[in-house]
């Protein structure tokens, strides 16, 4: 409950806001979940708390894991927590999945691409802009504020996009970067019976128990833009909201991507620290549109570690 | 111990306009949120909207939205409310409760504002 | 908007009676639910945050329990003093009460 997602890339700057909303006057406390111990809140940290914000100056890998924030205000105590997993820059271009925040979707009269979750960051001017890992250039594109403006959006420009800017505290500078998904409403188009692309039907997946891992249910629906198009997870046939585990999350937002022309959805479930319990449950992917739904399920098993003499 | 304490019983004709008064003792207004809350008479409660008192944000409920404005003067710790259009159907009691900004803890006594012709 | 749906609106009972009076909202709340009891002619008086948290001072025969969209409390056992009426407050998006329940005494 009142748990959120945030994901970053290591060496990168990551700033996390506590989900709980309330005054910036409030006293927040920040503890480490698994232990109890409390995040500090000088500077000279790498990851220390100021008030709703965690900061990771810059983020590792091994600081993935569940914080815990108390909002003390004078009338209650509320407690939130941040699911943070941090992962290991890509050697190539390819962004994955669970990099990927939510999509958003442009026509010719409004292409409007925002730099996701910049406003918690201490940035100036100008943000620079990528589309599938090469840099925009030419007039048709203007960096505005924390925006990309496109001029006569056209179908190719469809893609990936990743803003870079600089986080500055206390006169250090830290590089960020956001990748979301651009998607151009075509008014051609039409919708399908869902076709599940992951996981395949009755796939298992082999995972390390302690480790963390990520299911991608992946699904299409058709060409162009769809009016209903969803694609979520269940465990043993009940919604990830219903199954108080904060360690299973389902990420907020879809992404979408357009395959071969088709309008293909994804959404990714995070295990967070994979425990023996979750072998035992059902994992199922939903896809659904006005068509109807189609469900394919993926189970987790242990990883066999195989000896060589 | 924190009290708020709210201005009089009013009579009002329909059309006009009604402002309450909240103050606020052993505690300060800019602390927390503000919230203020109808009851029709014989009726149950409805939640009207809230106000940040230290940097004035206001949001209110879409029932109320055009009508009502929350302020705050964080200098005698004091809050208000303004409702206006008066209609029969606004004759209730109003109070004003503190809290933050899922829930409120201490209440008013509430001001009993009737609308007649 | 999330609606709240609360139930009963009104029920008799007896001192030393078990009483659970129920909301369900129509859409998944974050266990931000909280119960307040009112008494003729006084202010509501908050009992129970965040679905299952007393307040300090109120009475541990109070409890609040349930998660998602359907919610309760719970008065283990009647005093003279619980007849009242009460209700419940979402608090996920914006704030709604529910239509409030009256305890009386049977």
């Known amino acids: 409950k009142f748990s959120k997602q945030s994901w970053g890339l290591e060496n990168e700057a990551l700033i996390v806001r506590c989900p709980r909303q309330g005054k910036s006057s409030y006293i927040v406390d920040w503890y480490y979940s698994q232990t109890n111990k409390s995040i500090p809140t000088q500077e000279r940290n790498r990851v220390f708390a100021s008030g709703q914000l965690l900061k990771f100056l810059p983020a590792e890998v091994a600081d993935s894991g569940i914080y815990t924030c108390i909002v003390r205000s004078p009338t209650f105590n509320r407690t939130g927590y941040a699911n943070v997993t941090i992962y290991k820059k890509q050697p190539d271009c390819n962004v994955p999945d669970y990099l990927m925040y939510s999509t958003v979707s442009g026509s010719e009269k409004n292409s409007k691409i925002y730099c996701p979750t910049i406003d918690l960051y201490n940035w100036t001017a100008p943000l620079e802009w990528f589309k599938n890992c090469q840099a925009l250039q030419g007039s048709r594109y203007k960096a505005h504020k924390s925006f990309l403006v496109i001029d006569n959006v056209m179908t190719d420009d469809a893609g990936d996009y990743t803003c870079k800017f600089i986080h500055n505290e206390n006169g250090a500078n830290y590089s960020v970067t956001a990748t979301r998904s651009f998607t151009v409403k075509d008014e051609q188009g039409f919708s399908l019976f869902p076709v599940i692309r992951a996981p395949a039907h009755n796939e298992t997946k082999e995972v390390e128990i302690g480790e963390n891992t990520n299911l991608t249910c992946s699904a299409c629906f058709g060409k162009g833009a769809q009016f209903l198009a969803t694609v979520q997870w269940q465990l043993n046939g009940n919604k990830i909201t219903d199954f108080s585990e904060p360690r299973i999350q389902q990420e907020e937002g879809q992404n979408q991507s357009f395959s071969n022309g088709l309008a293909c959805v994804n959404t990714v479930l995070r295990i967070a620290d994979v425990k023996e319990e979750d072998l035992l449950l059902r994992y199922d992917c939903l896809a659904l549109n006005l068509h109807g739904l189609r469900r394919h399920t993926i189970r987790l098993s242990r990883k066999h570690h195989h000896h060589h003499h | 111990e924190v009290q708020l304490v709210q201005s009089g019983a009013e009579v009002k004709k329909p059309g006009a306009t009604v402002k309450i008064s909240c103050k606020v003792s052993?505690?300060?207004?800019?602390?927390?949120?503000m919230h203020w809350v109808q009851q029709a008479p014989g009726k149950g409660l409805e939640w009207m909207g809230r106000i940040d008192p230290a940097i004035g944000n206001t949001e209110y409920a879409e029932k109320f939205q055009g009508r009502v404005t929350i302020t705050a003067d964080t200098s005698t710790d004091t809050a208000y409310m303004e409702l206006s259009s008066l209609r029969s159907e606004d004759t209730a009691v109003y109070y004003c409760?503190?809290?933050?900004?899922?829930?409120?803890?201490?209440w008013g006594q509430g001001t009993l504002v009737t609308v007649s012709s | 908007d999330i609606q709240m749906t609360q139930s009963p609106s009104s029920l008799s009972a007896s001192v030393g009676d078990r009483v659970t009076i129920t909301c369900i909202t129509n859409?998944?709340?974050?266990?931000?639910i909280h119960w307040y009891q009112q008494k003729p002619g006084k202010a509501p008086k908050l009992l129970i945050y965040?679905?299952?948290t007393l307040r300090p001072g109120v009475p541990s025969r109070f409890s609040g329990s349930g998660s998602g969209t359907d919610f309760t409390l719970t008065i283990s056992s009647l005093q003279p003093e619980d007849f009242a009426t009460y209700y419940c407050l979402q608090s996920d998006n914006m704030l709604t009460f529910g239509q409030g329940t009256k305890l009386e005494i049977k």
């Open positions: 052993a505690f300060n207004i800019k602390d927390d949120y």
């Open positions: 965040e679905g299952n």
């Open positions: 859409t998944d709340i974050d266990d931000v």
């Open positions: 409760a503190t809290g933050d900004f899922y829930a409120m803890a201490y």
